[in-house]
């Protein structure tokens, strides 16, 4: 089942996806698409990277993090209700059936009819999960047995919506993506 993330109309949505390259320049292709992950690639591709760079993107979709370090989280700018739905992050790891696929559900809520806030109120900063645990427990990790030089880290979902973008940034900066081994 998909992990759910929320944002308000007019705000930026953040859909997290991470992997840890074996070395800073040793990247693997990643694609983002609108719709659940299919057998290969991503459906309705909105952004993709190759072994070196972002080689395709569409307006309003960009990578805010350092993708060269494996932060391939997607930012969708100025969201509308039409942006609601399932998004696929696919990390295309060499080897037999090694691809990591994450389906993330984005829920867009109507903007609150209040004075303009001084900070972003709904920032989707929950992290993707590999297993089914929830809450604020320790990070879950998976190391690919067939490719020991590539390690993926999955972070437990934050059950409660994070409403402070500063907190979200603090979380990301505090080592949410960690190198195992």
């Amino acid at each position: 089942s998909e992990v759910e993330y929320r944002a308000e109309v007019g705000q930026n949505a953040y859909l997290p996806c991470f992997y840890t390259p074996a070395a800073p320049g040793n990247l693997v292709p990643v694609c983002w698409g609108k719709g659940a992950c299919p057998v290969f690639e991503c459906g309705n591709v909105v952004l993709r990277t190759d072994e070196r760079d972002v080689n395709y993107w569409t307006s309003r979709y960009w990578l805010n993090g350092d993708f060269r370090k494996g932060d391939v989280s997607l930012t969708i700018e100025n969201v509308t209700l039409a942006d609601s739905g399932i998004y696929c992050c696919r990390i295309q790891i060499p080897g037999i059936m090694n691809d990591e696929k994450f389906n993330l559900k984005l829920v867009i809520k109507p903007a609150k009819v209040t004075p303009a806030p001084t900070r972003q109120r709904d920032f989707t900063a929950a992290f993707p999960r590999m297993l089914t645990t929830r809450g604020h427990g320790p990070a879950e990790t998976q190391t690919l047995g067939s490719l020991p030089d590539i390690n993926l880290t999955q972070i437990s979902t934050l059950a409660n919506e994070l409403r402070d973008s500063r907190l979200a940034n603090d979380l990301r900066d505090s080592g949410a993506t960690i190198r195992i081994g």
Partner: antibody
Framework: QVQLQQSGPGLVKPSQTLSLTCTVS??????????WSWTRQHPGMGLEWIGY???????YYTPSLKSRLTISVDTSKNQFSLKLSSVTAADTAVYYC????????????WGQGTLVTVSS | EIVLTQSPATLSLSPGERATLSCRAS??????LAWYQQKPGQAPRLLIY???NRATGIPARFSGSGSGTDFTLTISSLEPEDFAVYYC?????????FGGGTKVEIK
């Protein structure tokens, strides 16, 4: 335009290994954007997907053949290949190689097909 | 494994007529469904991908529709070269699977 040329024996003995090669022209097999795949069709029957290898090295095999199957790429020869071990008469089929465009799947290219008969 | 059931098995029509082919999936494949055409002795040819998008070079008389579990391929006016076998294929779940095919034959 990408073109695919298949080669390999049309007759294989039971318990041996079926080996087919697909040579790519009109494009580099190592450049991004394509998935290199194999599909087969038993005589008078429908199509069965075998597996693929992507430009990034991701490999997917159909579960029923996984234990006997190897799909690989030789970038120096601009080829990709299929090896199916321990064949039986049930593996008799026309085998097709194909390339799938990963940039939206809006085109694909197929080899001419090779009829492989498994018989002693 | 997702099972794709095509109907009818055979469709007998005359040139100029409209052909409607159905493909039903045993579970949702979202819009990840393709249609192929195959003529005797030839490799399959991609017609439609992602349920409704025409592949490069495919005439406008071919159209696809549907999502989830029910899909349709429509040939608005059959040309002589359209008489062939048509297969649907899903790429939503591994393994990729094909339907059993619909043969469109000349009446």
């Amino acid at each position: 335009q990408v073109q695919l040329q298949q080669s390999g024996p049309g007759l294989v003995k039971p318990s041996q290994t079926l080996s087919l090669t697909c040579t790519v022209s009109g494009g580099s097999i190592s450049s991004g954007g394509y998935y290199w795949s194999w599909t087969r069709q038993h005589p008078g029957m429908g199509l069965e997907w075998i597996g693929y290898i992507s430009y990034s090295g991701s490999i997917y095999y159909t579960p029923s053949l996984k234990s006997r199957l190897t799909i690989s790429v030789d970038t120096s020869k601009n080829q990709f290949s299929l090896k199916l071990s321990s064949v039986t008469a049930a593996d008799t089929a026309v085998y097709y190689c194909a390339s799938l465009d990963s940039w939206g799947s809006n085109r694909d290219y197929w080899g001419q097909g090779t009829l492989v008969t498994v018989s002693s | 494994e997702i099972v794709l059931t095509q109907s009818p098995a055979t469709l007998s029509l005359s040139p100029g007529e409209r052909a409607t082919l159905s493909c039903r999936a045993s579970q949702s494949v979202s819009s990840y469904l393709a249609w192929y055409q195959q003529k005797p002795g030839q490799a399959p040819r991609l017609l439609i991908y992602d349920a409704s998008n025409r592949a490069t070079g495919i005439p406008a008389r071919f159209s696809g529709s549907g999502s989830g579990t029910d899909f349709t391929l429509t040939i608005s006016s059959l040309e002589p070269e359209d008489f062939a076998v048509y297969y649907c294929q899903q790429r939503s779940n591994w393994p990729l699977t094909f339907g059993g095919g619909t043969k469109v034959e000349i009446k």
